[in-house]
């Protein structure tokens, strides 16, 4: 056998080159046939009407033909025949790769609530061979479950990702990335997660700055509440007691002027949104005013008093007890 061919892999729409090569040429005729065994070329003559076949080289040692705009129907065995005695035949297999036509990502709901599990689907349509789908949340790879559907030698792959969302996932992209021999570079599509979460509450003492609360002083506390959607209600309450008469509430701020010992207690900032309710506590302890010592007549004594301030903030972010978790469906 001195007739040789090589298998060809080509991407749909591109050019395949078929070569029939003779090692020891004796001027025998070379013929190229298609998978239906119709003659494409007999020497330099093309009996087929298909003008996508073009003669690249014709000699006693080679018949080289190009096939432009390859389609999946061109796939199969192409036969080289050498008219020796006895005749020789060799075949080359053309494999056509088809990149996915379309890449679609579908998210179960536009907005999810923290702790909820959502379904994300990605479909790569009509490829050959079947596409491999990879999932990423930001830079972290996740594992999906793929199903392959075959129709007329083409494959549609759907990958399902079940994703439990956390508040940190808000604004993070979920990426569906395909790997396919006909695709060079990165073919991907993404959707950004929108995660609703209950408020996180933090109390800031804005006055006095040194943090020591004495009788007669003023106290200013600011409640910072962050959630999604942004908390609609921020309220101050005094735990197990009435709010002092001289306390002033202004949005997220609580002012208590002219502090006295009866103001001692726990002050709670509560914030809520459609996901849930959370609070943070501030324990107020009012210290005695600084004592003034009258100046001595003869001796000067300097006394240094060190006061230790204990500032305790208790944060409780239980959702569902005081507030209801509600999923938003669109």
């Amino acid at each position: 056998q001195n007739l040789f061919t090589k298998d060809v892999t080509v991407i749909e729409g591109e050019v395949a080159t078929i070569s029939c090569q003779v090692n020891k040429s004796d001027d025998s005729v070379i013929q190229l046939l298609n998978p239906n065994r119709q003659t494409i070329y007999f020497r330099d003559f093309r009996p087929l009407k298909d003008s996508r076949f073009q003669l690249l080289n014709f000699s006693s040692s080679e018949l080289k033909v190009s096939l432009t705009n390859v389609s999946i129907s061109d796939e199969g065995r192409y036969f080289c025949q050498l008219y020796t005695d006895p005749p020789q035949e060799s075949y080359t297999t053309i494999t056509v790769l088809v990149p996915p036509r379309n890449l679609m990502i579908d998210i179960q709901k536009d907005t999810a609530v923290e702790g909820e599990e959502i379904e994300v689907n990605c479909t790569a349509m009509a490829s050959k061979p079947a596409t491999t789908i990879r999932w990423f949340k930001g830079n972290t790879e996740l594992k999906g479950k793929s199903e392959v559907e075959e129709w007329s030698d083409m494959y549609t792959v759907t990958s399902q990702l079940m994703l439990k969302v956390h508040k940190e996932d808000d604004g993070v992209p979920v990426i569906c990335q395909v790997e396919h021999p006909a695709v060079t570079g990165n073919l991907q599509t993404q959707r950004y997660l929108e995660v609703q979460y209950k408020p996180q509450v933090h109390i800031q003492m804005t006055y006095p700055l040194q943090g020591l609360t004495r009788e007669g002083d003023a106290l200013e506390l600011t409640c910072e509440a962050i959630g999604k959607p942004q908390p609609v209600m921020v309220t101050w309450v005094r735990v197990d007691d009435e709010m002092p008469q001289h306390a002033v509430l202004s949005g997220p701020n609580l002012f208590i002027n002219n502090l006295n010992k009866t103001d001692n207690g726990t002050y709670r900032c509560e914030a809520s949104n459609i996901v849930g309710k959370a609070h943070s506590d501030y324990m107020l302890y009012v210290y005695d005013p600084p004592t003034t010592i009258p100046p001595p007549t003869t001796t000067t004594t300097t006394t240094t008093t060190t006061t230790t301030t204990i500032l305790t903030i208790i944060t409780d972010s239980r959702a569902g007890e005081e507030g209801s978790i509600r999923a938003v469906d669109h």
Partner: nanobody, 118 residues
Framework: QVQLVESGGGLVQPGGSLRLSCAAS????????MYWVRQAPGKGLEWVSA????????YYADSVKGRFTISRDNAKNTLYLQMNSLKSEDTAVYYC???????????WGKGTQVTVSS
């Protein structure tokens, strides 16, 4: 101007014979390989036979081997196809063509109809 004119077609019964001719002009006939190609109703083109420049080497498709004979007369610039033991599947339009390495069917004849039927 290149011209290829086929003749000799017609209606024949299965088992019968016909001889097709192709008169060539407008090119140096003796310098080119010559071919017979056919197209059956509703089918693609099928290569039937080939002959080298001098006529010493002939080639046939498996479907006609042993029944058809290709020949040429370089002095008369004519190509022939002797068809024996005709079958109904030989029904087609027969074209003659020359292998000039040029793509397409620009240098083919108009064809002659062969119908094999009882």
């Amino acid at each position: 101007q290149v011209q290829l004119v086929e003749s000799g077609g017609g209606l024949v019964q299965p088992g019968g014979s016909l001889r097709l001719s192709c008169a060539a002009s407008g090119f140096t006939f003796s310098s080119y390989w010559m071919y017979w190609v056919r197209q059956a109703p509703g089918k693609g083109l099928e290569w039937v036979s080939a002959i080298n420049t001098g006529g010493g080497s002939t080639y046939y498709a498996d479907s006609v081997k042993g029944r058809f004979t290709i020949s040429r007369d370089n002095a008369k610039n004519t190509l022939y196809l002797q068809m024996n033991s005709l079958k109904s599947e030989d029904t087609a339009v027969y074209y003659c063509a020359y292998g000039n390495g040029v793509e397409g069917m620009d240098y083919w004849g108009k064809g002659t109809q062969v119908t094999v039927s009882s």
